[in-house]
Structures are given as C-alpha cells and as structure tokens.
C-alpha cells in the first residue's frame, strides 16, 4: 500500500517517498521505484537554503552600488548574499533593498543613538543644562560651561542651542 505521509527530509511523489535535495542543491529528477532522487549542486551565484524539491536554485541578491548598497556577507550555495549600506547611509527596510542618507540632528538636538547600516540616527532634545549648536549625525548635546569653575559668572543664559556666556565677576546690579 502506498504511503500517505513521508518522514522529515522526504516528500511524496507518485505514491512513494522521495528524498529532498539538501541545502546547496536542486532537484534534477524525482525518485522512482528503482532510483533515488537526483540532485545537482547550485551553480555559482545561486543558492538554496533549505531541504527542497525545487528545480531551480535562487539567484544571489545583487547589492546595487547605485542604490548605496554594498556586500556585507557574500552568498554561498546555501545562503543568500547579505547587503548593507555604504558608510553614512542606512537601509530603508529590513530586506535592505535600498539605502537613504543618515539623518542629522538639528541644533537644539543631540544624537541619542548613532545610525547603523540598518537604523537611522535617533535624536533627542537637549535638556536644560545642555546645548547643541550644530547639525550633526554624531554629536551628543554638550553641557553648558560651568562659569564658576573658571572664577567667572554667567553673563548670558544658555539655551538648547547656545552655551552660556561667562564674564568677570565685577558687574553689580
């Protein structure tokens, strides 16, 4: 009596259990009562990641430099190529099909988290006591200058975009 289910790494074909092709190969012919499944290694530039019965391997992903992409990890017969973005850029999606330029944090904001190949810059407002006077993808907020440690007094208050201005302690009001 023909089987109705096959074991793991097998598949049912014409009433019999055939072996699946292993990762890195593709199906060339199904098994018969006399012959085992025939498989063939994936060609260069192709891969198959799982036990399979596919007649074609998958093409390796192309990391298009025109889209800001570069190869992070070269593909093998069992794995796809992994793309990442050029320095200063990050992926627009998890699949990393294209890249966009890292965001800069505006004056009044500092970098909370520096961008990576897969995530954009995260900015945060500078709190009281800190400032940022530049647009940057790397700089955190800087603390206001402590005038007292220089034996000076605050002549002008700091803001989230400007440092305090220190001056001599000779001005009475």
């Amino acid at each position: 009596e023909p089987p109705t289910a096959c074991s793991d790494k097998q598949y049912l074909h014409d009433g019999q259990c055939c072996d699946l092709c292993q990762p890195g190969s593709r199906l060339t012919s199904h098994c018969t009562a006399l012959e085992k499944t025939q498989c063939h290694p994936c060609d260069s530039g192709e891969f198959s990641a799982q036990w399979n019965r596919e007649i074609r391997c998958h093409q390796h992903k192309y990391c298009d430099p025109n889209l800001g992409l570069r190869v992070q990890q070269k593909g093998t017969s069992e794995t796809d190529t992994i793309c990442t973005c050029e320095e200063g850029w990050h992926c627009t999606s998890e699949a990393c099909e294209s890249c966009v330029l890292h965001r800069s944090c505006s004056p009044g904001f500092g970098v909370k988290q520096i961008a990576t190949g897969v995530s954009d810059t995260i900015c945060e407002p500078c709190p009281v006591g800190f400032f940022s006077n530049v647009s940057s993808a790397f700089e955190k907020c800087h603390p206001w200058t402590s005038c007292e440690t220089k034996d000076l007094v605050v002549q002008q208050a700091g803001t989230n975009k400007t440092d305090v201005v220190c001056g001599p302690q000779d001005r009475l009001r």
Epitope: P125, G129, K140, C141, E148, V153, V154, V164, R171
Partner: antibody
C-alpha cells in the same frame, strides 16, 4: 538657612504696574536663579521666568514677555518682578523660588517665598 | 511647550490607605546623556506655598517622609503615598524641568474621607 521673603499683598488699579520684591537670605544671592511662578485659583502653577542676579541674565516664558520684567539688586539681595498694564487676569498669587542647584542642571524649586497676592480691581 | 497632564484631578481616601496619582508629559523627560528624568513633584497645603517632595522623578527631598515615592520614566510618572495621613491633605503638582518654559501639571487634589 535659605529664605525668600516676599511682601504681603498689593491692591492695584487696572492699567497700573506693580513691582514685587523677593528678598533672599542664607546663600550667595548672585549665584542662583530666582524663579517666578504665578498661581491663579483654578489655574494651577505657571512658570513666568527666571533671573540670575549676578549678571541680570533672564529667561522668560513667551506667554509673559511684555508683561513681566525681572531685575535684581545684589547690594540688597533682592530680586524684583514688575508686572505692567495690569488687568483682572493678572490677579493671582506670585511666588519667587530658588532651585536647589546653581544654573546648569534644570530647575526644580527647592525653596519658595510665601507668595505675594496681587489683586487688580477698579 | 511640554504639556503636563495629571490624573485624577481629585480623589478622596481614608487615613491609612495607599494612594497613587499620575502625571504624563507630552514628550519624554528622560535624557539619555545622564539617564535622568527631569521631573519634580510638589505638595501644596491649603494657604501655603508649594513644597518640593521629589526630584529626578524618584529622588526624595531631604526631610520628606518615606511614605512618599516617585516612580516612572519617559512620559509616564506616578506619585505614591503608601499610607495616607490626615496632614497629607493637599494639592500635588508635577513639573518638568527638561526644557523651557518649565511647565506644571494641573494638580491632583487629595481629600481625606
């Protein structure tokens, strides 16, 4: 110990100006911001702004620019807030307060005056 | 401006009960540079000036009874009174000092049953 002394109450006519004093004792007056806070019944607390007596440097809440003016006299350790063109909306208790730290870490208000009640009435 | 919202606006509890009140900010008060939350809590008893209870969201001011506890981070904060006393009758305000203008919540009025 740190103390902030305010005047009791002021009854003012609409259109007039009032200058509210806040006398500080128990610390180096010039080195710490003096904060000003408004409290109207049912309106909670509103920050008006701050003055650093050593330099006269100020920060104002945009809402109170043109209404409030801060000054400080380091010889008498007194900060002042002048309110101009008074209307009934300015009737409130006005507090002066001092942050715990000096000027560079944000202000939570550790010390408070007892408040000055300003009533604006024709 | 950062908007501070407090809830409930009032609550009535019996002496000995635990009470919690909430304060929410319209933007995060946590600064990653020092991992501090720029939030303070004040108590204002009838006819008195406000009194500082808590700063940096959870640091109790010197002399404040340990039944008062501040907690929370980012945009959601809580003031808890573990066992209310009759003397705790007051309005409680939160305040952000992350950015100018400093802003206060509308207050939570605590009444004693």
């Amino acid at each position: 110990q740190v103390q902030l002394q305010q005047s009791g109450a002021e009854l003012m006519k609409p259109g007039a100006s009032v200058k509210i004093p806040c006398k500080a004792t128990g610390y180096t007056f010039s080195s710490y911001w003096i904060e000003w806070v408004k409290q109207r019944p049912g309106h909670g607390l509103e920050w008006i702004g701050e003055v650093l007596p050593g330099s006269g440097s100020t920060n104002y809440n945009e809402k109170f620019k043109g209404k409030a003016t801060f000054t400080a006299d380091t010889s008498s350790n007194t900060a002042y807030m002048q309110l101009s063109s008074l209307t009934s909306e300015d009737s409130a208790v006005y507090y002066c307060a001092r942050p715990y730290y000096r000027y560079d870490v944000g202000a939570w208000f550790a010390y408070w005056g007892q408040g000055t009640l300003v009533t604006v009435s024709a | 401006d950062i908007v501070m919202s407090q809830s409930p606006s009032s609550l009535a509890v019996s002496v000995g009960e635990k009470v919690t009140m909430s304060c929410k900010s319209s933007q995060s008060l946590l600064y990653s540079g020092n991992q501090k939350n720029y939030l303070a809590w004040y108590q204002q008893k009838p006819g008195q000036s406000p009194k500082l209870l808590i700063y940096w969201a959870s640091t109790r001011e010197s002399g404040v009874p340990d039944r008062f506890t501040g907690s929370g981070s980012g945009t959601d904060f809580t003031l808890t009174i573990s066992s209310v006393k009759a003397e705790d009758l007051a309005v409680y305000y939160c305040q952000q000092y992350y950015s100018y203008p400093y802003t206060f919540g509308g207050g939570t009025k605590l009444e004693i049953k």
